[in-house]
Amino acid sequence: MGRARDAILDALENLTAEELKKFKLKLLSVPLREGYGRIPRGALLSMDALDLTDKLVSFYLETYGAELTANVLRDMGLQEMAGQLQAATHQGSGAAPAGIQAPPQSAAKPGLHFIDQHRAALIARVTNVEWLLDALYGKVLTDEQYQAVRAEPTNPSKMRKLFSFTPAWNWTCKDLLLQALRESQSYLVEDLERS
């Protein structure tokens, strides 16, 4: 079972019977990418969440199936769930950012990310941790994670706690942290880039 398939299933299982019915009706009219067919109405309307997940994956494959599911959820007003689903499917085997949709993941990049390369220096030298937390909150940090970092007494311990969550992040999530660092302490990033 693929990661995206499991994420689609959990999203659909979270819908009430009424919402699942609405989801199926919207699926019948949602715009599709060129080359993809529509799931037949007769079969679609009788499906439960598990059957529908399998049908979405067999018709659209995992990645597009998840994107399509997220589009329909968003159209239903379920923005948070849609965002989490879309973020999860950009993750591969990593953990999904919480809440807000992450931008599409760029092509795989070789080597370590900047924040992994400079972990020790960032723990020692970042002073504006609150800025980072506010920038990451709802995008890659859950409320619990946000509060856990804030509860730490010193900047290094805050950063150490923040880094305890990064093994589960994908490249895009780490880019968000790097962007926040550039905005809050650009001189530090420039210094580390030169080193």
Epitope: M1, R3, D6, A7, L9, D10, A11, E13, N14, L15, T16, A17, E19, A49, M81, Q84, L85, A87, A88, Q91, S93, G94, A95, A96, A98, D143, E144, A168
Partner: antibody, heavy 124, light 107 residues
Framework: QVQLQQSGAELARPGASVKLSCKAS????????INWVKQRTGQGLEWIGK????????HNNENFKGKATLTADTSSSTAYMDLRSLTSEDSAVYFC?????????????????WGTGTTVTVSS | DIKMTQSPSSMYASLGERVTITCKAS??????LSWYQQKPWKSPKTLIY???SLADGVPSRFSGSGSGQDYSLTISSLESDDTATYYC?????????FGSGTKLEIK
């Protein structure tokens, strides 16, 4: 902090039913699943089933079909398990446990937080 | 159902000793394997998830490894507080199934 507070011990007659509760606090109840686990005295752990609190959808272990019914009340952030037609085999400690979803974690449906446990004793 | 075979069922070890507990699944569980510690009359406590990730607040002497069907929990240097029963759980496929447990005691 995140807590799952379970209801107090139950003493029931054979054939009766009991309803156990698991009150969640410290997080958004609808963004995680809830599992129920059985442990007989001196024995191992057995998964009963899971519920998606937002929708009420459930998945039960076949061994507990007809025995355990899982429900959730989002307004009070409480999950419930009804155990019916009780026999001495149902005497056990029952735990609830929280799980993240597949679109929320790298490892969905593992049990990240456990409840305090409820002891059920079935005796005539 | 996926069967989880956990070994040993019980063991004695000395303080400071390296301890390893294993779990074998009857089929590939794709690292959807977690480990739990339970002390008498207490709720279980999560130690490891996704086979190798350390849960919040768990001492670094605990580690998990493995993939496919074979997984292990290692305590690098046993402490007196580690006396407990340890369980593995596969949660990749319903019904979720636990190992039978390993009771760990100090020599």
């Amino acid at each position: 902090q995140v807590q799952l507070q379970q209801s107090g011990a139950e003493l029931a007659r054979p054939g009766a039913s009991v309803k156990l509760s698991c009150k969640a606090s410290g997080y958004n109840f609808t963004t995680y699943g809830i599992n129920w686990v059985k442990q007989r005295t001196g024995q191992g752990l057995e998964w009963i089933g899971k519920i998606y609190p937002r929708s009420g959808n459930t998945h039960n272990n076949e061994n507990f079909k007809g025995k355990a019914t899982l429900t959730a009340d989002t307004s009070s952030s409480t999950a419930y398990m009804d155990l019916r037609s009780l026999t001495s085999e149902d005497s056990a400690v029952y735990f609830c446990a929280r799980s993240p979803y597949a679109f929320y974690s790298s490892s969905y449906w593992y049990f990240d937080v456990w409840g305090t446990g409820t002891t059920v004793t079935v005796s005539s | 159902d996926i069967k989880m075979t956990q070994s040993p069922s019980s063991m004695y070890a000395s303080l400071g000793e390296r301890v390893t507990i294993t779990c074998k699944a009857s089929q590939d569980i794709k690292s959807y394997l977690s480990w739990y510690q339970q002390k008498p009359w207490k709720s279980p406590k999560t130690l490891i998830y996704y086979a190798t990730s350390l849960a919040d607040g768990v001492p670094s002497r605990f580690s998990g490894s493995g993939s496919g069907q074979d997984y292990s929990l290692t305590i690098s240097s046993l402490e007196s507080d580690d006396t407990a029963t340890y369980y593995c759980l596969q949660h990749g496929e319903s019904p979720f199934t636990f190992g039978s447990g390993t009771k760990l005691e100090i020599k």
